[in-house]
Interface confidence: medium
Amino acid sequence: VPPGEDSKDVAAPHRQPLTSSERIDKQIRYILDGISALRKETCNKSNMCESSKEALAENNLNLPKMAEKDGCFQSGFNEETCLVKIITGLLEFEVYLEYLQNRFESSEEQARAVQMSTKVLIQFLQKKAKNLDAITTPDPTTNASLLTKLQAQNQWLQDMTTHLILRSFKEFLQSSLRALRQM
């Protein structure tokens, strides 16, 4: 349930037990469309998309990234390792998606939908990986303090953080999409 909402506002989902690859593919493409809309607002509002100072802000963030060892790339592809990485990465992105809430004016619904749709995607992938126990969930206390820290940044850093989260999340999802199509 999004922050500040009553659960009665949300139609509780009853998802089918089996989630096809096509459905997961569609869910990711749907989230990517949402990210595009959010990036459009971010880029229109500030010059962050052309900024060369990304490295300054990137040092503050520990955004999930795909690496060779994760087994998601064509070379050294490993279905199990990769699936664990995708789920773990999405779980780690959740705190950053929480940060994005209230960061948008004309795209408020898109920001909330990206967050909600990511939760659903995680559910789908967890079903697919039901026999994998190597998935670690981020510590809620650590997430809470990270969120507080991000929200306490100055305006320029907050804008840069928003831009970096969207860019990294887009790249992570695109890599995930390519990898999941191999599974």
Epitope: P2, K8, V10, A11, R15, Q16, R23, E105, E108, M116
Partner: antibody, heavy 122, light 108 residues
């Protein structure tokens, strides 16, 4: 309990105007996009117009563009549809509908009002 | 003409399975939602996001989507399931579109 109650319908002559209202309760109105959907007698559902949660973004079906205006007053938890230059083909039951959370591009309507009848006839 | 195509009518024997289809090019990348409408009443959401059921909707209602076709399945149709069913999605210009509706008759 979520409730949507439409009012303002009635009989109007072609070329006339009407303003529909939809009073919302039981949910955080200011955080939900809303739509108007109509249904002509014996026909299917037709989307008319939508407005985002803050009221800054609106969209309209081609059949009503330039004649109808959707608006909202979040302080009063009320959605409006101002209908001008009405035509006989606008005759329908007009429903106010709350958009669910899971979509922004493909919104679904998880709650509907009971509808208000608009008849355009001379 | 609707951008989403549904059969105008369908009959099913009590207790049997009814499958209502909804066809449209946009359904390959957009979600389909389904509504049930009984005479003189407002529509009720029965399936959203292709295959998800809101709370309070019986388990006999399920949904699926593949390519450009969405399907609403009612397994073990009951007399109270008789009514009109509409699929809904969005077109490329972000406008909401409804299918023309399917009248389901449950033969008892």
């Amino acid at each position: 309990e979520v409730q949507l109650v439409e009012s303002g319908g009635g009989l109007v002559q072609p070329g006339g105007s009407l303003r529909l209202s939809c009073a919302a309760s039981g949910f955080t109105f200011s955080r939900n996009a809303m739509s108007w959907v109509r249904q002509a007698p014996g026909k299917g559902l037709e989307w008319v117009s939508a407005i985002n949660s803050g009221g800054g973004s609106t969209s309209y079906a081609d059949s009503v563009k330039g004649r109808f205006t959707i608006s909202r007053d979040n302080a009063k938890n009320t959605l409006y549809l101002q209908m001008n230059s009405l035509k006989p083909e606008d005759t329908a039951v007009y429903y106010c509908a709350k958009e669910g959370y899971t979509g922004w591009k493909d919104p679904m309507y998880d709650y509907w009002g009971q509808g208000t009848q608009v008849t355009v006839s001379s | 003409q609707s951008a989403l195509t549904q059969p105008s009518a369908l009959s099913v024997t009590l207790g049997q399975t009814a499958k209502i289809t909804c066809q449209g090019g946009s359904l390959g990348s957009r979600y389909a939602h389904w509504y049930q409408q009984k005479p003189g009443q407002a529509p009720v959401l029965v399936i959203y996001d292709d295959d998800s059921r809101p709370s309070g909707i019986p388990e006999r209602f399920s949904g699926s989507s593949s390519g450009g076709r969405a399907t609403l399945t009612i397994s073990g149709a009951q007399a109270e399931d008789e009514g009109d069913y509409y699929c809904q999605s969005a077109d490329t210009s972000e406008h909401i579109v409804f299918g023309g509706g399917t009248h389901l008759t449950v033969l008892g």
